[in-house]
C-alpha cells in the first residue's frame, strides 16, 4: 500500500523531521506549513489548524519560507552617493551600491553601508591598480620614460613621445616637446580608450567626489591626456 500523504498540521513520526517548507511547532507539537516569501505568520498553527499567513506590509519583506510573526523592515533609502540596484519589495530588501566613480569602503551583508570616492592620481602618477566596487584605486609614480599629466582615477602613465630633436625633455608629469619635425609615438594610433575600475591607497592622491571619465586620447598632442586604466583585477 502506498504511504499516505499527511496534511499539515500533523504529528511527525518519532525521530523523523518535518518536510520541506514545513516547521515543527513546539507548542502544538505538530508539523505546520511555513509561509512563502513575501508573507509572514499571522496566526501560528494549533493541533487542529494550520499556520495562517498574511502578506508583508509596505516597506517590509521576507525573502525565505518562514514562520516569523512580523516581516523584516527594508533598509533605509539609498544615499546620494549610491544607486538602488534592487528595490524594496515584499520578497526582497533594498540593495544600495556605490555609484560610478565611488567604491564601497564599508560593506554590509548585501550592498554597501558606506561609499567613498575613488582616489584620483595626480600628474606624475598613474593608476597601478584600478578601483573596483570594493577597493580604491592604487596610484604609483610614473616609471622613467613615462608620464601622466592628468588628475584621474583611471589614467595610466604612457611613454614620452620620441623626438628627432627634443625641445623640452619629458618628465613624470609632462610629455617631451619636440621641435617642429614630426614626433614618433610609442603606440599604435587610435588605440586605448578603456572603461573604468584593484586596490589600496597612496598618499600621492587627492580623493575627489566626481567620477572621472577620461577624454578621448590624441597621441599626436604632446600634452594629450593619458589613456585610462581599464577595470582590472577585481577582488
Amino acid at each position: 500500500l502506498p504511504a499516505q500523504v499527511a496534511f499539515t498540521p500533523y504529528a511527525p513520526e518519532p525521530g523523523s523531521t518535518c518536510r520541506l517548507r514545513e516547521y515543527y511547532d513546539q507548542t502544538a507539537q505538530m508539523c505546520c506549513s511555513k509561509c512563502s516569501p513575501g508573507q509572514h505568520a499571522k496566526v501560528f498553527c494549533t493541533k487542529t489548524s494550520d499556520t495562517v499567513c498574511d502578506s508583508c506590509e509596505d516597506s517590509t519583506y521576507t525573502q525565505l519560507w518562514n514562520w516569523v510573526p512580523e516581516c523584516l523592515s527594508c533598509g533605509s533609502r539609498c544615499s546620494s552617493d549610491q544607486v538602488e540596484t534592487q528595490a524594496c519589495t515584499r520578497e526582497q530588501n533594498r540593495i544600495c551600491t556605490c555609484r560610478p566613480g565611488w567604491y564601497c569602503a564599508l560593506s554590509k551583508q548585501e550592498g554597501c553601508r558606506l561609499c567613498a570616492p575613488l582616489r584620483k592620481c595626480r600628474p606624475g602618477f598613474g593608476v597601478a591598480r584600478p578601483g573596483t566596487e570594493t577597493s580604491d584605486v592604487v596610484c604609483k609614480p610614473c616609471a622613467p620614460g613615462t608620464f601622466s599629466n592628468t588628475t584621474s582615477s583611471t589614467d595610466i602613465c604612457r611613454p614620452h613621445q620620441i623626438c628627432n630633436v627634443v625641445a623640452i625633455p619629458g618628465n613624470a608629469s609632462m610629455d617631451a616637446v619636440c621641435t617642429s619635425t614630426s614626433p614618433t609615438r610609442s603606440m599604435a594610433p587610435g588605440a586605448v580608450h578603456l572603461p573604468q575600475p584593484v586596490s589600496t591607497r597612496s598618499q600621492h592622491t587627492q580623493p575627489t567626489p566626481e567620477p572621472s571619465t577620461a577624454p578621448s586620447t590624441s597621441f599626436l598632442l604632446p600634452m594629450g591626456p593619458s589613456p585610462p586604466a581599464e577595470g582590472s583585477t577585481g577582488d
Epitope: V192, T200, T233, G234
Partner: antibody
Framework: EVQLVQSGAEVKKPGATVKISCKVS????????LHWVQQAPGKGLEWMGW????????KYGQKFQSRVTITADTSTDTAYMELSSLRSEDTAVYYC???????????WGQGTLVTVSS | DIVMTQSPATLSVSPGERATLSCKAS??????VDWYQQKPGQSPRVLIY???IRYTGIPARFSGSGSGTEFTLTISILQSEDFAVYFC?????????FGQGTKLEIK
Amino acid sequence: EVQLVQSGAEVKKPGATVKISCKVSGYSITDYLLHWVQQAPGKGLEWMGWIDPEDAKTKYGQKFQSRVTITADTSTDTAYMELSSLRSEDTAVYYCAAQSGTGTMDAWGQGTLVTVSS
Amino acid sequence: DIVMTQSPATLSVSPGERATLSCKASQNVGSNVDWYQQKPGQSPRVLIYKASIRYTGIPARFSGSGSGTEFTLTISILQSEDFAVYFCMQSKSYPITFGQGTKLEIK
C-alpha cells in the same frame, strides 16, 4: 632606472619553508607594487600575488593563498616572499616584478631558483 | 580563472620577415593585456602594455592590437635578437594569468 636584485638559489626539503628577498634600488620601494611570479622548469609564468609596500596591503592568487606570505621592509627597500609546506612541484624560478603607474610589470628581478628535493 | 591561450606554440620565421603571435582570452578582458619577451636564462621584459602601448625603449617593429578576447603581437621585421619566448598576460581580474607562451624560432 629601477633595479630588482633577488637572493640566491635555495635547495629545500619537502615540507620546509623558503623565504626569498627582492631588493629595490634606484627608486623607493613604495613607488611600486611588487609582484611575485613562479616559473616551473620548461613551464609558463604563474602569478602568486602582490604587495603595496606603501600600506602593506597584499593580494594573493588562490592557488598559493594558503602557503604564501608577501611582506616588505620599507626601511631597506626590500620585499620578501615566503612559501611554506614545500613540495616537489614548487621547484621553480621565482621572480619579483615591479609595477609602476603604467599598470604593467615594468621591471623584473633576475629570478631565484628554488629546488625542492628529498 | 581567465585562461589565456597563445598560438601557435612554436613559430618558425626567417629574419627580416614578419611574425604574428596570437593570444585569446576565455572571457572579455577589455584592453587589459600585456606582452612580455623572455630569452633563455633571462627574466621576462615588458614589450606592450594595455594591449597596444609600446613600452618605453621598445623598438617600433613591435606592435600590439586587439581588445575583448583576441589580441595580436606583431613583429614587423624580425631581427636575430627577437627570437625568444613571448607571453601574454591579462590583468582584468584575479588571478592575473599568463598564456603558455609562443616560442619564436629561426626558420
